[in-house]
């Protein structure tokens, strides 16, 4: 039995898989900040985790995925306000009893030092200094991401 949040993640991922591949993004759009090979957009309002997930998708983006500790630190360096929390694309999968990124991969336990419990209806937020487990219904800001990728022409087999 999947939670409503897990269903939401899966639905968004499946709909993304169905869409035709867009050409790669060479530069960050206006209002987005570049961080290495990503473009980040920080919200100016607050939402629970699933609303944040949905809102990023309206911008043809996803909630932030963090590859490793190094990327976490670089992202945190962009956060100017000490006490502000931001949702990222990581929540607790009850069925798999593990932290799961919205792209379907599981958290490598060495990547993030999470403060708080790993339990049902828990989602991950970051601040300028830390990573927290929060109730997914908590209303905080969030970070969307787009990947910067070189343009690659997709080769289709002859029909």
């Amino acid at each position: 039995q999947k939670s409503s949040i897990e269903k939401c993640s899966v639905d968004i991922q499946q709909s993304r898989n169905k869409t035709t591949e867009r050409p790669g993004l060479l530069n960050c759009p206006i209002y987005w900040q570049q961080l290495r090979e990503k473009c980040l957009l920080f919200s100016h309002t607050v939402n629970p985790w699933n609303n944040s997930l949905a809102d990023c998708s309206t911008k043809e983006s996803s909630l932030l995925l963090i590859r490793d500790k190094d990327e976490l630190i670089h992202t945190q360096n962009l956060i100017r306000d000490k006490a502000i929390l931001f949702w990222i694309g990581l929540n607790f999968s009850l069925s798999e009893k593990n932290w799961k990124w919205i792209n379907g991969s599981f958290l490598n336990s060495n990547d993030l030092e999470i403060r708080g419990d790993a339990k049902e209806n828990s989602c991950i937020s970051i601040s300028q200094t830390s990573v927290y487990s929060e109730y997914c219904s908590t209303e905080i800001r969030w970070i969307c991401q787009k990947e910067l990728t070189p343009v690659r022409n997709k080769v289709y087999p002859d029909s």
């Epitope: 100016h44 309002t45 809102d55």
Partner: antibody, heavy 120, light 107 residues
């Protein structure tokens, strides 16, 4: 067209509370975050906080955190700002202002303002 | 908190003049700066966002520029309806702050 219509002027005694309303029309009320900004007589503008009408989530300027409460009633597309333990320096015009974009902090439409006078 | 200092506080000018108002931030705010116009007894009206992007319906005589800590609002040819008070605002941090205002008066 977008309109934000606020409640009328109020006169309050120090220590009392005031609740100002802001009725939205001409757009989807739950689609835009509402902010509150005040302006003391002859002074500049001061941001007080925000409410997301869709979820009810709030975020307040630390200066007002212990005294302000922002709420909304989606059935009548109205946002409210209540300020308690009023002091004479709370005398100001209070504006509701719509956040123009979830990802940028500008206010594209404003209410006409509500004058709150705090006097003994 | 990020402080915004506007100069001048008062400015006298005539119809047809070109005027420039400056807004200085106490810290780097990138281009997260907004300009508003306010007339007596009225609410502020959005003119410019992101330092230089005119809001829908704002006449082209209004332009904004700058990044980092110094920003300007320029009115290329003053019209009678432009006499008002102008405010800058930053949203680089989540504690939004406003400048003290520049009152533009008829000479």
């Amino acid at each position: 067209q977008v309109q934000l219509v606020q409640s009328g002027a109020e006169v309050k005694k120090p220590g009392a509370s005031v609740k100002v309303s802001c009725k939205a029309s001409g757009y989807s009320f739950t689609g835009y975050t509402m902010n509150w900004v005040r302006q003391a007589p002859g002074q500049g503008l001061e941001w007080m906080g925000l409410i997301n009408p869709s979820s009810g989530g709030t975020y307040y300027n630390q200066k007002f955190k212990d005294r302000v409460t922002m709420t909304r009633d989606t059935s009548i597309s109205t946002a409210y700002m209540e300020l308690s333990r009023l002091r004479s320096d709370d005398t100001a015009v209070y504006y509701c202002a719509r956040l123009g974009d979830n990802y940028r902090g500008y206010f594209d439409y404003w209410g006409q303002g509500t004058t709150v006078t705090v006097s003994s | 908190d990020i402080q915004l200092t506007q100069s001048p506080s008062f400015l006298s000018a005539s119809v047809g003049d070109r005027v420039t108002i400056t807004c200085r931030a106490s810290q780097d705010v990138g281009t997260a700066v907004v300009w508003y116009q306010q007339k007596p007894g009225k609410a502020p009206k959005l003119l410019i966002d992101w330092a230089s992007i005119r809001h829908t319906g704002v006449p082209s005589r209004f332009s904004g520029s700058g990044s980092g800590t110094e920003f300007t609002l320029t009115i290329s040819s003053l019209q009678p309806e432009d006499f008002a008070t102008y405010y800058c605002q930053q949203y680089s941090t989540y504690l939004y702050t406003f400048g003290g205002g520049t009152k533009l008066e008829i000479k």
